[in-house]
């Protein structure tokens, strides 16, 4: 795969992943009411990082924001922080990678600068993806713990009042946002890795092991090794450099925008 293609594909994959991370962060369905083995209720509860919602069979949906910071579980705060850090790093990664794209010429920026920027954006995307994956996984772990705790409570009869009145404990299971977050984090991570791989090909290493040849009068050609130039260590293949005339031009102009999916 050519450097341009690898870099471009890495950028697009990261962009899709980043859009997914934003979508997952905004979605309300991080946890949804567990309907299995439960009395069928005419009310469906689901929760996000920022608000909890209730959808009635009447079609009426009511969402309430978490207007407190102190009263929220530390784990939820941590997940919020991880997702926001992931988004911030993703934004920086996108901005850096736009300037690093081989198919865009900006001023007199040389390939070594583009290589460094590509590596930087790749690392940013990798960290962004990891943040999202960790955030979603922490939330999922919290759900699993709470699920089994509430299951134990249901079967130990803690909800009942003297055995006369039954109360139904709402149990929550994985919501769509978790799956979106995992996939998005994975895509961002993969895109970042591709950007790092593309960086190898962008490294100006044509001076590595350069040999100087000269002709001695009537003698055979002799070779003398030139001075060894320290390289990035990513390889020593010399690449042909394409030069694009004109201003900044992109091969990928379309940008995917995150859409918030809401139950109606």
């Amino acid at each position: 795969m050519s450097v341009t293609a690898c870099q471009g594909l890495g950028f697009v994959v990261s962009l899709i992943g980043f859009a997914g991370i934003i979508a997952a962060t905004c979605m309300d369905q991080w946890s949804t009411q567990d309907l299995y083995n439960n009395p069928v209720t005419a009310v469906f509860n689901y929760q996000g990082l920022w608000r909890s919602c209730v959808r009635e069979s009447s079609g009426f949906t009511e969402c309430r924001g978490y207007f407190t910071l102190l009263g929220l579980p530390a784990m939820l705060q941590a997940v919020r922080a991880l997702m926001i850090v992931g988004i911030v790093l993703g934004v920086i990664g996108i901005l850096v990678s736009i300037f690093a794209l081989k198919c865009i010429r900006i001023g007199s920026m040389d390939d070594s600068a583009k290589a460094k920027m590509t590596l930087t954006s790749g690392i940013l995307f990798i960290i962004s993806g990891i943040c999202a994956i960790i955030g979603v996984s922490v939330f999922a772990n919290m759900l699993v713990t709470n699920f089994w705790m509430s299951t134990a409570n249901m079967y130990s009869g803690m909800g009942g009042m003297g055995g006369m009145v039954q109360t139904v404990q709402t149990r929550y299971t994985f919501g769509a946002a978790l799956f979106v977050g995992w996939v998005a984090g994975g895509l961002t991570l993969i895109g970042g890795v591709m950007m790092c791989i593309a960086c190898r090909g962008l490294t100006p290493d044509d001076s590595n092991f350069k040999a100087v040849s000269y002709h001695a009068s009537g003698q055979n050609v002799a070779y003398r090794p030139g001075g060894f130039k320290a390289s990035t260590g990513f390889g020593s293949n010399t690449r042909n450099k394409k030069i694009y005339d004109g201003g900044a031009r992109t091969e990928d102009d379309e940008q995917s925008h995150p859409t918030k999916y809401d139950y109606v």
């Epitope: 069928v40 005419a42 009310v43 009447s58």
Partner: antibody, heavy 118, light 113 residues
Framework: QVQLVQSGAEVKKPGSSVKVSCKAS????????IEWVKQAPGQGLEWIGL????????NYNEKFKGKATITADKSTSTAYMELSSLRSEDTAVYYC???????????WGQGTLVTVSS | DIVMTQSPDSLAVSLGERATISCKSS????????????LAWYQQKPGQPPKLLIY???TRESGVPDRFSGSGSGTDFTLTISSLQAEDVAVYYC?????????FGQGTKLEIK
Amino acid sequence: QVQLVQSGAEVKKPGSSVKVSCKASGYAFSNYLIEWVKQAPGQGLEWIGLINPGSGGTNYNEKFKGKATITADKSTSTAYMELSSLRSEDTAVYYCARVYYGNSFAYWGQGTLVTVSS
Amino acid sequence: DIVMTQSPDSLAVSLGERATISCKSSQSLLNSGNNKNYLAWYQQKPGQPPKLLIYWASTRESGVPDRFSGSGSGTDFTLTISSLQAEDVAVYYCQNDYFYPFTFGQGTKLEIK
């Protein structure tokens, strides 16, 4: 304004079937559930089931499964309830109602009296 | 199924006096997601369909006089008519709107003493 108009009273023989209609107007028919309620003479209210006119999805009270079949026709904004294998205990006033906030029934049809008599 | 039990079965109250009807459910009708109780109250006069008075246990339906009020949470609910009027003579039903199948109380007949 929201209106639910039900079909007229019916007198049926035991073992036969009856189809009661409920024509809705004044709102987007597909967007709200239609519920059916039975009230036997001098008795209380009993929920039969509901239909989502948009999707055609139904939910029945176990007691009325096999007895009642609820359908809806979006083109005419009409919900139907068919009662099969009629018996004397099916004699009642049947109401259709539109769901509202809190899953409550804010709008009701005028009721259809079904009399099962030999 | 959820059992809704109303008390009393019938009630005679003087005009202008307070009338109180109780309703108990066999399971809590409180939804933790929005902290709302899914219980409705209806008024039915002879030969008429029921009329919605209260939903979410305490929210008055538009057009319903403010002498009607609902209260309670979980399994115990109350409908109160603060000052009985002649037109309030009817049968009152509470309804579980939380669990399928939706179930009604047996009804309370309210009369004037």
